[in-house]
Interface confidence: low
């Protein structure tokens, strides 16, 4: 089941471990001497773990929502371990036997590897914004065609939800050109139904562009023009976007 | 995850050859555009084409006319295949999902 | 080492969502490393000395605290709009 734990409690904890990941990169980077001869090598893997490390857990981090808590913990544990490992250690380090470095070093990446399994919200090219993901075609298709390649990777052509939602997808859009939406009167004309069957309601209505729909010769589906929306032939190749929800992981 | 192309030659001109791209660790279905880049010796890059995994729809820059023709033959491999072959083709041959993860390359020399 | 550089990306026209560009890096014998992607968003295990910025049509990838192992061929690659151009195009190298 989905990991039931509030954002900020999440949000506070992702951040603790942040914290300690960046205090021990400061440690070891800042603290420990530069060591000479065949102890540097291992110096700067462990080094090189750290900082990718780091790059991992920051681009995670802002997404706070359904996250695998035991492996949150467990990194959040070993991190605690590590640092007090090396600041032991920090005094003699880099010592004479590589065993200790090497140690590290391989705790180092299995912490890596922990953090890999935290499962991506959106799919790589994906955006993330409000617990959803969208996926901005880099092509162009009809209406129909847009529909359906939504369906063939399990999402939809664009449901808008919330005003912060068309903001960013107008503005997105805009930069780009015509794009389509997952709204259509094509069932019945005047009657604007998203894909999932749903009709458009009345406070979306402000953001038809001038003068629309003006259904200009059959113009049932509906896209992002300029600053607002617009209703369009159908067959016309424009971009498109999809949306699905962002996938929480799963424990065990 | 991971890229690999295969197929790579010493061909004469004229004649045709087919490149394989084989993912491991996922799908090249779905939501990924695969790409095809090559190289020519001590060149740079130069996109080939690409293909949407979701429905097999493909795209090619001017410059191809017809000689290459990218298509998904499963749910891990991808091919691109070349006829009319000249020297100016001799390069190496790379496979990309949206242009992020990369294949090592395969060498065709014509 | 230890300086910094600055490469600049000029496309003849606007890129997708005037953010759809790309920064690799590519070494002798190995394919093109992504660096940056959507013109700022820095690729997983791509150390934060790299940054890319730049919007439309004109580009900037900067390297900061150079370092030896970072010698190499840096690439942009610009997404476009395929209804009216090739959807893709590469940069000559730097």
């Known amino acids: 089941q989905v990991s039931k734990t509030p954002n900020t409690e999440r949000q506070k904890e992702q951040e603790k471990i942040l914290q300690e990941l960046t205090q021990l990169t400061d440690e070891l980077t800042s603290r420990i001497p530069i060591s000479q001869g065949k102890n540097e090598s291992m110096q700067a893997k462990i080094t090189e773990q750290l900082m990718q490390l780091k790059t991992e857990l920051l681009s995670r981090i802002p997404i706070f929502q359904g996250q695998n808590e035991s492996i949150q913990e467990k990194i959040s544990e070993q991190l605690m371990q590590l640092k007090a490992e090396l600041l032991s250690k920090i005094s003699s380090f880099p010592v004479k036997d590589d065993s200790k470095q090497e140690k590290i070093y391989q705790q180092l990446v299995q912490m890596k590897t922990e953090l890999f399994r935290l499962c991506r919200l959106c799919p790589w090219d994906w955006t993330f914004l409000l617990g959803n993901c969208y996926f901005f075609s880099k092509s162009q298709r009809n209406w129909n065609d847009a529909v359906t390649a939504c369906k063939e990777v399990k999402a939809q052509l664009v449901i808008i939800n919330s005003d912060e939602e068309q903001t960013f997808l107008q503005q997105t859009s805009k930069a780009k050109g015509p794009t389509w939406m997952g709204l259509s009167d094509l069932k019945k004309e005047a009657t604007w139904l998203w894909v999932d069957g749903s009709t458009l309601s009345s406070r979306f209505q402000k953001y038809w562009n001038r003068g629309e729909p003006n259904n200009i010769g059959e113009e049932d589906c509906v896209e992002f023009a300029g600053d607002g929306w617009n209703d369009s032939k159908c067959e016309l190749k424009k971009f498109w976007i999809c949306k699905k929800s962002a996938t929480p992981c799963t424990e065990g | 995850e991971q890229l690999m192309e295969s197929g790579g030659d010493l061909v004469k001109p004229g004649a045709s050859l087919t490149l394989t791209c084989t993912a491991s660790?996922?799908?090249?279905?779905?939501?990924?555009?695969s790409h095809w880049v090559r190289q020519a010796p001590g060149k740079g890059l130069e996109w080939i084409g690409m293909?949407?995994?979701?429905?097999?729809?493909t795209w090619y820059p001017s410059w191809v006319n017809g000689r290459f023709s990218i298509s998904k033959t499963s749910s891990t491999t991808v091919t691109l295949q070349m006829t009319s072959l000249t020297a100016a083709d001799t390069a190496t041959y790379f496979c990309a999902r949206d242009l992020g993860l990369w294949g090592p390359g395969t060498l065709v020399t014509v | 080492v230890g300086g910094t550089v600055t490469i600049k990306c000029q496309s003849s026209?606007?890129?997708?969502?005037?953010?759809?560009l790309s920064w690799y890096q590519q070494k002798p014998g190995q394919p093109p490393k992504l660096l940056i992607y959507?013109?700022?968003t820095l690729a997983s295990g791509v150390p934060s000395r790299f940054k890319g910025s730049g919007s439309g049509t004109q580009f900037t990838l900067t390297i900061s605290d150079l370092e030896c192992d970072d010698a190499a061929t840096y690439y942009c690659?610009?997404?476009?709009?395929?209804?009216?151009?090739?959807?893709?195009?590469f940069g000559g190298g730097t």
């Open positions: 959507q013109a700022s």
């Open positions: 690659a610009g997404g476009y709009d395929c209804s009216s151009a090739d959807c893709f195009a």
């Open positions: 026209q606007s890129i997708v969502y005037n953010n759809y």
């Open positions: 660790g996922f799908d090249v279905s779905g939501s990924y555009y």
């Open positions: 293909i949407y995994n979701g429905d097999g729809s």
